[in-house]
């Protein structure tokens, strides 16, 4: 039950921040004109990864897409790419993960396989959760370098006594929405690594004979994957040979400390 | 069609407050900013300040401390009051209704004369 | 606040001549994002409120005659009048659209010779 609830709640929280994953990317405040301390203007700027925006006071809205990739600076098409990768391996994830959910029966899909692509969807979800982490802390990076240098030569001079007012961006409110969906996929990711643990089922241990070689100790386990021999210097804590018989399901109830070496 | 029509008392005495109420018709409030601007006989035009649809105003910084601007949409109506005039704040007082993009002003009222003297 | 210089103050014309007129910003109006002058230029005919006749330093205003044609980016700009007509002898003003408080040059009066 536990195991079914961290799943879920995994997915749900992934599911979350993959769809703020994708609003940020799509979101035309990545960075904002910085209004302190700077000369009063009808005119507000805004820019995101794709296009940059203008908003009159009037309410007037112009937008602008980049139409080139070339002339774009290294850093944008970074994050660009980081944000996209986050999204594609998130949108794999949810797939994975919507078949590897407890509650949903497909056929006759072994736990194990559940287990397996649980895990799969996780590291998905970590690895899309810490690239949209990455690409917007590239930005905001990106920002911070840029105001700065451009507070240093606030106004630049335009032949004598004309001026010209430097815009300066400062954060936009698309990436503290990258910076949250991204720790969200990040933290669904881990619970979902977490119930993958749960739902592992243990080694299939078969009513089996133990034959006893003169020479070393073989325990030979029919349809299992696993010879144990008496090779190798921690054989003696391997748990080889249950004994008892119990039933499948026993088997997969009571795991035992030895079932996680 | 879109029409601005300022109204004002004509006279006022120094030192006392002008009110001057734009009614506007053709447009919302709502959507679009109202400017005033006055002129003296004779000068130019100088911009007293800005009431936009949202509500965001902004003045003169020389008449800052003078001046209001308020608005009434459901009666469609923009209100400017000015305290402690003086003569030289004689003009001739414009409404006008700012343009959706280029921050320009596309309709203007007829305008109201304002004359301080005792 | 920004200063506004136009200038000639005045201009003695005769019809169908080409008349210019420049308007200097004391910063520039350019804005970087949608790379737009925010200047607007003003037609004032004697005993009428103004008329607006550009915006964006360059959009001419719907109803607006294409001999009238503005120009001019950063902190300066110009009007030109290719052809003058009897009907556009007023005095014309050109505004900083681009920061707080909006402010309006001395004008340009256009007199007939």
């Known amino acids: 039950m536990a195991v079914t609830a961290c799943q879920g709640l995994g997915f749900v929280v992934s599911l979350i921040g993959i769809a703020g994953i994708i609003a940020a990317t799509c979101m035309d405040q990545w960075s904002t004109q910085d209004l302190y301390n700077n000369p009063v203007t009808a005119v507000f700027n805004y820019q995101g990864l794709w296009r940059s925006c203008v908003r009159e006071s009037s309410g007037f809205t112009e937008c602008r897409g980049y139409f080139t990739l070339l002339g774009l600076p290294a850093m944008l098409q970074a994050v660009r790419a980081l944000m996209i990768v986050g999204i594609v391996l998130g949108a794999i994830g949810l797939l994975v993960s919507i078949f590897a959910l407890k509650c949903i029966r497909i056929g006759s899909m072994e736990d194990s396989a559940k287990a397996n692509m649980t895990l799969t969807s996780g590291i998905m979800f970590i690895v899309s959760g810490l690239c949209a982490i990455a690409g917007v802390s590239v930005f905001a990076n990106m920002l911070v370098t840029n105001f700065w240098m451009s507070t240093a030569n606030m106004y630049t001079g335009m032949g004598g006594m004309v001026q010209t007012v430097q815009t300066r961006y400062t954060f936009g409110a698309a990436l503290f929405v990258g910076w949250v969906a991204g720790g969200l996929t990040l933290i669904g990711g881990v619970m979902m690594c977490i119930a993958c643990r749960g739902l592992a089922p243990e080694e299939t241990n078969y009513k089996a004979v133990s034959y006893h070689a003169s020479g070393h100790s073989v325990a030979y386990k029919p349809g299992g994957f696993k010879a144990s021999t008496g090779f190798g210097s921690n054989t003696k804590n391997k748990k080889i040979y249950d004994g008892g018989a119990r039933t499948e399901d026993e088997v997969q109830s009571y795991p035992s400390k030895h079932d996680y070496v | 069609q879109v029409q601005l029509k300022e109204s004002g008392p004509g006279l006022v005495a120094p030192s006392q407050s002008l009110s001057i109420t734009c009614t506007v018709s053709?447009?919302?409030?709502?959507?679009?900013?109202v400017s005033w601007i006055r002129q003296p006989p004779g000068k130019g035009l100088e911009w007293l300040g800005v009431?936009?649809?949202?509500?965001?105003?902004y003045y003169n910084s020389a008449l800052k401390s003078r001046l209001s601007i308020s608005k009434d949409n459901s009666k469609s109506q923009v209100f400017l009051k000015m305290n402690s005039l003086q003569s030289d704040d004689t003009a001739m007082y414009y409404c006008?209704?700012?343009?959706?993009?280029?921050?320009?002003?596309?309709?203007w009222g007829q305008g109201t004369s304002v004359t301080v003297s005792s | 606040d920004i200063q506004m210089t136009q200038s000639p103050s005045s201009l003695t014309v005769t019809a169908g001549e080409k008349v210019t007129m420049s308007c200097k910003s004391s910063?520039?109006?350019?804005?970087?994002?949608?790379?737009?002058?925010?200047l607007t230029w003003y037609q004032q005919i004697p005993g009428q409120p103004p008329k607006l006749l550009i915006y964006?330093?360059?959009t001419r205003e719907s109803g607006v005659p294409n001999r009238f044609t503005g120009s001019g980016s950063g902190a300066e700009f110009t009007l030109t009048i290719s052809s003058v007509q009897t009907e556009d002898l007023a005095v014309y003003y050109c505004?900083?659209?681009?920061?707080?408080?909006?402010?309006f040059g001395a004008g340009t009066k256009l007199e007939l010779k």
């Open positions: 910063q520039s109006l350019l804005n970087s994002g949608n790379q737009r002058n925010y």
């Open positions: 964006w330093a360059s």
């Open positions: 009431m936009w649809g949202g509500g965001n105003t």
């Open positions: 505004q900083n659209s681009y920061f707080y408080p909006f402010t």
């Open positions: 006008a209704k700012q343009r959706y993009g280029g921050n320009a002003m596309d309709y």
């Open positions: 053709g447009f919302s409030l709502t959507d679009y900013g």
